[in-house]
Interface confidence: low
C-alpha cells in the first residue's frame, strides 16, 4: 500500500481554483525526492504535467505551481483558471518516474450554473441555518408573503405569512419581520439537509404588482480535513460545532458505507475496538471538543465524522466536521507489545517509547478510565511524585537518549489489570497504550525477600537478602530505595562470578543489602529486581520499618557514619580453576573492615563491579570503593 | 495526588469585588486546565471560568465582563478576580484542575477539586 496521501475527491467550477495537499512519510530521501502531479491516460499511462523539478507542461503554464513544505512531509499543489478540461483522474506522487509511491485524485470541474440574473445566492454548510431576505414594495406590504421552492413544473410552498407551513419544514421554517421596516421580510430555515438545496422565490402580493425575488440555495457537506498518522501513533479529532449546540450531546462517528458507526459519544456510548484508547474531551461552552485516540492501528483508517445532538446519534439537519484518516505503515513508532501480563504479587516492566529527538521531554504514565467521557489521571512521572495510592509499588525509570523509559509496577493485585497509557509533555503522536492483565499467581514468585517482615533497629546492622533463580543467574541484580520521586539504585558489591557456570544451586542464589548502622531516614520502601543492561526485568518490594533499640539488646558503634548500606551478591559457582579469593586494600574502612563481606560461598572471579547509581533521593550521596560499597547519609 | 486550598472567599455588598485565590500542591505536573465552579444552595455546580497552561480562558455567561481568571504556572495558582458582584453570585465557589489528557465542560471532566470557599453578596 503506497504511503502517500491525498484528497481522493476534488470538485470546484470553471474559472475558479483548486489547492490540492499531498502527504509523504517524514524521512530525510522522501524530503528532497522529486514531487510530481501527473494525469492518468487511458492507456494507464501518466502524463507530468507539473513536478518539483521545475518541469510545467503547456496546459498548465501560468495558472500552476506545485510546493514541497519538508517541515510538514506536504507538498501543494495549485490550478487556477480551471475549465471542465480539467475534470479527469491524476496522481500526486514521489520519485524519479511517475511509477514511484503515488495518490490517485479525481478533479471534477462544473460549469457555473445558469441562474436567472437577479437570483441572490446563499452557501450554507449541512445542518447550519439560514435567512433569506425578502424585499417587497410598500404597496405590498398589506399582501400576503410567501416562500416556495421551484421544482420541475410548479414552486411548492415553504411558509406563508399566514402561517401555512410545508409538512418537511415544520418546526425549521419561520417567517417574520423585523421592527418597524415594511419593506422586507424574512424567512429562516434551520437544519438544513442536501434536499433543501435549489432554487427558491420568495414573494410579496399577488398578480402582476407582487415583488419577486429569486434565491438560490447551495447546501454543502463539509470538506473533510486530512490527517495524515503514522501506525501505534495517537490523532486528536478537534470538534468545533458552534455555541448553537453547546448544550447538546456530542459524538464522533466513522463512516460505514451508507451509515455511520459511533465510536464514541458524551452519552457514554464507546466502541469496544477503542476501549483503552480513546477519551471525549468537552472543551467549553461555544460547542467545541476534542476526541483523542492513541495507538492507531491500520484498520483505523477511514472517513470520520463528529457531531451534536441530544441523541448522542448522527441526525440529518445537523452541524457536523469530516475527517479522512491515513494510517501510514512506515511507522516512525517501535512496535512494542501491547499487552503486558503479570500475575498477583507480581511485577510488570513496561517499556514506554518516545520521540528520540525530545530526550528531555517529561514522560508520564496515567491509567485510562472509562467512566463518563474517559480519562487518564496521571499517576507517575519524571520530576514528578508517585501519586498516593501507589506508594511503594511504582516507579518510572527514565533511560536519557534512547528513545524509551520504564514504568515499573510490583506487588500486583487484579484491581491493576486494565489500559495504561505512555505520554511525554512533548510529540503528542508518541502516546501509547498498554492493557495490563493480572492473573491470579499459581507459584511462587521468581524474586523473595527474607525477613519478609523487616524491622530494624535504630544504630544496629540490618541485612535483607533477596532470593533469586538461576534463570537470572547472567542478570544484574539491584537493589534500590523507593520515594515518591523514584527508585534510586544502591550501589552494589558483586561477589560473584559473571562467567557461564558448570551447575546452579537454586537456594544459595541471593543478593544482600546491609544497612550499618541503622538510622531513622532508612525506613522505607525497598526494592529487589534484576536488568540486563538498560532492560529492567522483575523487582519485589520490602517495607523495612525502623525502631528505637529496646534496653539491654547489644550497640554497634558507627565508627563511620559514611559507612551506611551495602548491597552483595552471593552466586554459587562451580569452576575448579579459581580457587583464591582476592584480597584487596580498603582506603577507607569502613565498620565492616576486619570482617569478611560474605561467607564464601563458592570460587570466587571477576573484579567486583558496582553499579552506577542511578540518581540520589533524599539527598543523599553515595560513593564506592573497591571492595566496599557504602551508601553514605 | 494534587491539592488545591482556596482562599478569599466572604461577605460583599452587591456591586463590590472580591479576589479569590487556589494554590495547588502535590503532583502537579498533571495539571492542565485550571478554573473556578460554583454551587448555590439546591441547585448544581456550574462553570465559573476555566484557564489553560497556555492561557486560554473560558467564561461562563453569566459572569463575561465581570469577573477575569488568571493563572501563575510557575507558582501553580489560579485567581478569580470578581468586580460588580450581584447577589445571584452567592454560592460555594471550587477551585478545580484537570489532568494530563481530561477536559472540561461542566466539571464531569475535572480529576481535582478544591473543599470550597463561601461567597456570600448582600443586596
Known amino acids: 500500500k503506497s504511503p502517500i496521501f491525498g484528497p481522493q475527491e476534488v470538485s470546484s467550477i470553471e474559472g475558479d481554483s483548486v489547492s490540492i495537499t499531498c502527504y509523504y512519510p517524514d524521512t530525510s530521501v522522501n524530503r528532497h525526492t522529486r514531487k510530481y502531479w501527473c494525469r492518468q491516460g487511458a492507456s494507464g499511462m501518466c502524463t507530468t504535467l507539473i513536478s518539483s523539478n521545475g518541469y510545467l507542461s503547456k496546459e498548465y503554464s501560468g495558472r500552476a505551481n506545485l510546493i514541497n513544505f519538508p517541515e510538514n512531509n506536504t507538498f501543494v499543489i495549485n490550478i487556477e483558471q480551471l475549465t471542465q478540461d480539467d475534470t479527469g483522474s491524476y496522481k500526486c506522487g514521489l520519485g524519479t518516474s511517475n511509477r514511484g509511491l503515488s495518490f490517485d485524485v479525481s478533479l471534477e470541474v462544473s460549469q457555473v450554473p445558469e441562474l436567472p440574473s437577479d437570483t441572490h445566492v446563499y452557501t450554507k454548510d449541512i445542518g447550519r441555518n439560514v435567512t433569506i431576505e425578502c424585499p417587497f414594495k410598500r404597496e405590498n406590504a398589506p399582501s400576503k408573503k410567501s416562500l416556495c421552492k421551484k421544482t420541475n413544473q410548479s414552486c411548492e410552498l415553504v411558509i406563508d405569512s399566514t402561517e401555512k407551513v410545508n409538512p418537511s419544514y415544520i418546526g425549521r421554517a419561520k417567517l417574520f419581520m423585523k421592527g418597524t421596516d415594511l419593506t422586507v421580510f424574512y424567512v429562516n430555515i434551520s437544519h438544513l439537509t442536501h434536499n433543501d438545496a435549489g432554487l427558491y422565490i420568495c414573494q410579496a402580493g399577488e398578480g402582476p404588482s407582487a415583488d419577486k425575488k429569486n434565491v438560490d440555495l447551495q447546501v454543502l457537506a463539509p470538506e473533510p480535513e486530512l490527517l495524515y498518522k503514522d501506525l501505534r501513533s495517537s490523532v486528536t479529532f478537534e470538534c468545533d460545532l458552534g455555541r448553537e449546540v453547546a448544550n447538546e450531546a456530542k459524538y464522533l462517528c466513522r463512516m460505514n458505507k451508507e451509515t455511520c458507526d459511533v465510536i464514541i459519544n458524551t452519552l457514554g456510548k464507546r466502541d469496544p475496538d477503542f476501549e483503552g484508547r480513546i477519551l471525549i474531551t468537552p472543551k467549553d461552552d461555544n460547542g467545541r471538543f476534542s476526541v483523542l485516540i492513541t495507538g492507531l492501528r491500520k484498520e483505523d483508517a477511514g472517513h470520520y465524522q463528529c457531531g451534536a445532538h441530544s441523541s448522542g446519534l448522527p441526525q440529518e439537519g445537523w452541524p457536523i466536521q469530516t475527517w479522512q484518516l491515513f494510517v501510514n505503515e512506515e511507522s516512525t513508532i517501535p512496535n512494542r507489545r501491547s499487552v503486558v501480563k503479570g500475575v498477583t504479587g507480581g511485577s510488570v516492566a513496561i517499556a514506554c517509547p518516545y520521540n528520540p529527538k525530545e530526550s528531555s521531554s517529561l514522560k508520564y504514565w496515567c491509567r485510562w478510565e472509562g467512566d463518563g467521557n474517559g480519562h487518564c489521571p496521571v499517576l507517575v512521572g519524571t520530576q514528578a511524585q508517585v501519586q498516593e495510592e501507589y506508594e511503594g509499588r511504582l516507579a518510572l525509570f527514565d533511560q536519557p537518549g534512547n528513545g524509551t523509559y520504564t514504568v515499573i509496577l510490583n506487588q500486583l493485585t487484579t484491581e491493576d489489570a486494565g489500559f495504561y497509557w505512555c505520554l511525554t509533555n512533548g510529540d503528542s503522536r508518541w502516546r501509547t497504550t498498554i492493557e495490563l492483565q493480572v492473573a491470579e499467581a499459581t507459584r511462587e514468585p521468581n524474586l523473595e525477600v527474607t525477613p519478609q517482615n523487616a524491622t530494624a533497629v535504630l544504630g544496629e546492622t540490618f541485612t535483607v537478602s533477596c532470593h533469586y533463580p538461576c534463570k537470572f543467574y547472567s542478570q544484574e541484580k539491584y537493589w534500590c530505595k523507593w520515594s515518591n520521586k523514584g527508585c534510586h539504585i544502591l550501589p552494589s558489591h558483586d561477589e560473584g562470578a559473571r562467567q557461564s557456570s558448570v551447575s546452579c544451586d537454586q537456594s544459595s542464589q541471593l543478593v544482600s543489602m546491609t544497612l550499618n548502622p541503622v538510622s531513622k531516614e532508612d525506613e522505607g520502601w525497598y526494592w529487589c529486581g534484576v536488568k540486563q543492561g538498560q532492560t529492567y526485568g522483575e523487582t519485589t518490594a520490602i517495607y523495612i520499618a525502623v525502631e528505637e533499640r529496646t534496653r539491654g539488646s547489644s550497640h554497634v558503634n558507627p565508627t563511620d557514619a559514611n559507612a551506611r548500606a551495602k548491597v552483595a551478591l552471593e552466586e554459587e559457582v562451580v569452576d575448579s580453576s579459581i580457587s583464591e579469593k582476592e584480597n584487596k586494600a580498603i582506603p577507607n574502612p569502613g565498620p565492616f573492615a576486619n570482617e569478611r563481606e560474605i561467607q564464601n560461598v563458592g570460587d570466587q572471579a571477576q573484579e567486583n563491579r558496582a553499579s552506577g547509581d542511578a540518581g540520589s533521593a533524599d539527598g543523599q550521596s553515595r560513593s564506592s570503593s573497591s571492595k566496599h560499597h557504602h551508601h553514605h547519609h | 495526588q494534587v491539592q488545591l486550598v482556596e482562599s478569599g472567599g466572604g461577605l460583599v455588598q452587591a456591586g463590590g469585588s472580591l479576589r479569590l485565590s487556589c494554590a495547588a500542591s502535590g503532583s502537579i505536573f498533571a495539571i492542565n486546565g485550571m478554573g473556578w465552579y460554583r454551587q448555590a444552595p439546591g441547585k448544581q455546580r456550574e462553570l465559573v471560568a476555566v484557564?489553560?497552561?497556555?492561557?486560554?480562558?473560558n467564561y461562563a455567561d453569566s459572569v463575561k465582563g465581570r469577573f477575569t481568571i488568571s493563572r501563575d504556572n510557575a507558582k501553580n495558582t489560579v485567581s478569580l478576580q470578581m468586580n460588580s458582584l450581584k447577589p445571584e453570585d452567592t454560592a460555594v465557589y471550587y477551585c478545580a484542575a484537570t489532568g494530563v489528557l481530561a477536559g472540561w465542560a461542566a466539571g464531569d471532566g475535572m480529576d481535582y477539586w478544591g473543599k470550597g470557599t463561601l461567597v456570600t453578596v448582600s443586596s
Open positions: 484557564i489553560t497552561r497556555g492561557g486560554s480562558t
